[in-house]
Interface confidence: medium
């Protein structure tokens, strides 16, 4: 028997679901009788999902696999796993044995979009050319961990005195607070860019300074 | 490279029960199935029953079933079958047997190297 | 259960010879059997499995054919390693049977 899955990484955002597509080649005469069937993680071998003895053994793995049961018999042991979750990342081995067996592992990558920068300056009054300006870029509940980029009015980027720090909440979201000190010119604009890698979704913010007041 | 070690040869009676182990090294023991085959003294091959470590679910052999039973440890990668009952008809040697990672549930690449049971009053 | 038969049990033969076991399933098993050989005190050795195809790593003087119900396993130049007893298989079921076992002695 040969197992087939898809090469590239399964892309699925949190709390949606996604299918771990696995597929082999019955045999002419083949029941469902003859099917063992396994999902586990790669890594850990921790059973995910079974089908063996004719029936499916149900979810091993918080109660939110399924397989769809009408399409085995036609050769498609696909995994539905619903509600996903950042802890869901990972390799997923799909095990077949009929008379022989073989297995393929599929990635499951999971991605959440980061909210539009909100910006904060520090001071944010009484500013003056020459003065140094801390400029506080912070976007939330993303995943995986972002790159961000700063540039100025021009499009110049701005690599010096940026310090970025990712801090993962209790759902394993990230949210990002990225700090830029610059010494004020006479009018400037400072954007942020948030990018989610998985996604390759953008997320800008810019403060405007033109004296008083800010624009953001 | 699996290895399978299984426990040393035992002398039983007559109606008592054995618990013969097969620890499994070098391998991935939870997701294939380990079996238990037997040979009598100068007689064929006799397969018994296997289990899958990762299902906790084991298969028997018409003529054991209710005779025997076939558990895992995966936190220690061994297998053991128990046989009750025993007669002398069960003197023989005991494999266990596996189809290793890229075989076969059903075919044995590796083998334990043998349990002698005899049965004798 | 599927039985197996093989036959013959014994034979004798001499280095050099081309050699063939044959095994019938009680009903057709399609593809699904295998060959082992046993040494005396020894477990037994995969050599065939799904009836044709070789085990890594065994010489290819031994080959395996058939289909349904009739299977052969052939040794085109018998060595002196191969004195042995040679075995079939049936997996078609969850249930596996061996044959009773083929004897391979010097003439």
């Known amino acids: 028997v040969e197992v087939q899955v898809s090469e590239d990484p399964v892309v699925a955002l949190v709390d949606t679901d996604a299918t771990l597509r696995c597929s082999f080649s019955p045999e002419p005469g083949f029941s469902l009788a003859q099917l063992n069937l396994i999902w586990q993680l790669t890594d850990t071998k921790q059973l995910v999902h079974s089908f063996t003895e004719g029936r499916d053994q149900g979810s091993a793995y918080s109660n939110r696999t399924a397989l769809f049961p009408d399409l085995l018999v036609q050769g498609n042991a696909s995994l539905r796993l619903q509600r996903v979750r950042v802890t869901d990342e990972g390799s997923y081995t799909c095990f077949v044995s009929i008379q022989d067996f073989d297995s393929a592992a599929v990635s499951l990558q999971v991605a959440a979009p980061y909210s539009k920068p909100s910006m904060t300056l520090e001071p944010n009054k009484d500013l003056r050319p020459g003065n140094m300006v801390t400029i506080t870029c912070s976007s939330y509940q993303g995943y995986p961990e972002a790159e961000v980029f700063w540039k100025d009015g021009q499009g110049v980027p701005l690599t010096g005195n940026v310090t970025t720090s990712q801090m993962a909440n209790e759902r394993g979201l990230f949210d990002v607070h990225s700090v830029l000190r610059v010494v004020l010119g006479a009018n400037g604009t400072y954007s942020c860019l948030v990018r989610n890698p998985v996604l390759q979704q953008d997320a800008h913010g810019s403060v405007t300074i033109t004296g008083q007041p800010l624009t953001f | 490279q699996v290895q399978l070690v299984e426990s040393g040869a035992e002398v039983k009676k007559p109606g008592s029960s054995v618990k013969v182990s097969c620890k499994a090294s070098g391998g991935t023991f939870s997701s294939y199935a380990i079996s238990w085959v037997r040979q009598a003294p100068g007689q064929g091959l006799e397969w018994m029953g296997r289990i899958i470590p990762i299902l906790g679910i084991a298969n028997y052999a018409q003529k054991f079933q209710g005779r025997v039973t076939i558990t895992a440890d995966k936190s220690t990668s061994t297998a053991y079958m128990e046989l009750s009952s025993l007669r002398s008809e069960d003197t023989a040697v005991y494999y266990c047997?596996?189809?290793?990672?890229?075989?076969?549930?059903?075919?044995?690449?590796?083998w334990g190297q043998g349990t002698l049971i005899t049965v004798s009053s | 259960d599927i039985q197996m038969t093989q036959s013959p049990s014994t034979l004798s033969a001499s280095v050099g010879d081309r050699v063939n076991i044959t095994c019938r399933a009680s009903?057709?098993?399609?593809?699904?059997l295998a060959w082992y050989q046993q040494k005396p005190g020894k477990a037994p050795k995969l050599l065939i499995y799904k009836a044709s195809y070789l085990q890594t790593g065994v010489p290819s003087r031994f080959s395996g054919s058939g289909a349904g119900t009739e299977f052969t396993l052939t040794i085109s130049s018998l060595q002196p390693d191969d004195f042995a007893t040679y075995y079939c298989q049936q997996y078609n079921s969850y249930s596996l049977t061996f044959g009773g076992g083929t004897k391979v002695e010097i003439k």
């Open positions: 009903q057709t098993i399609n593809s699904w």
């Open positions: 047997a596996n189809g290793g990672d890229s075989s076969s549930w059903y075919t044995f690449d590796y």
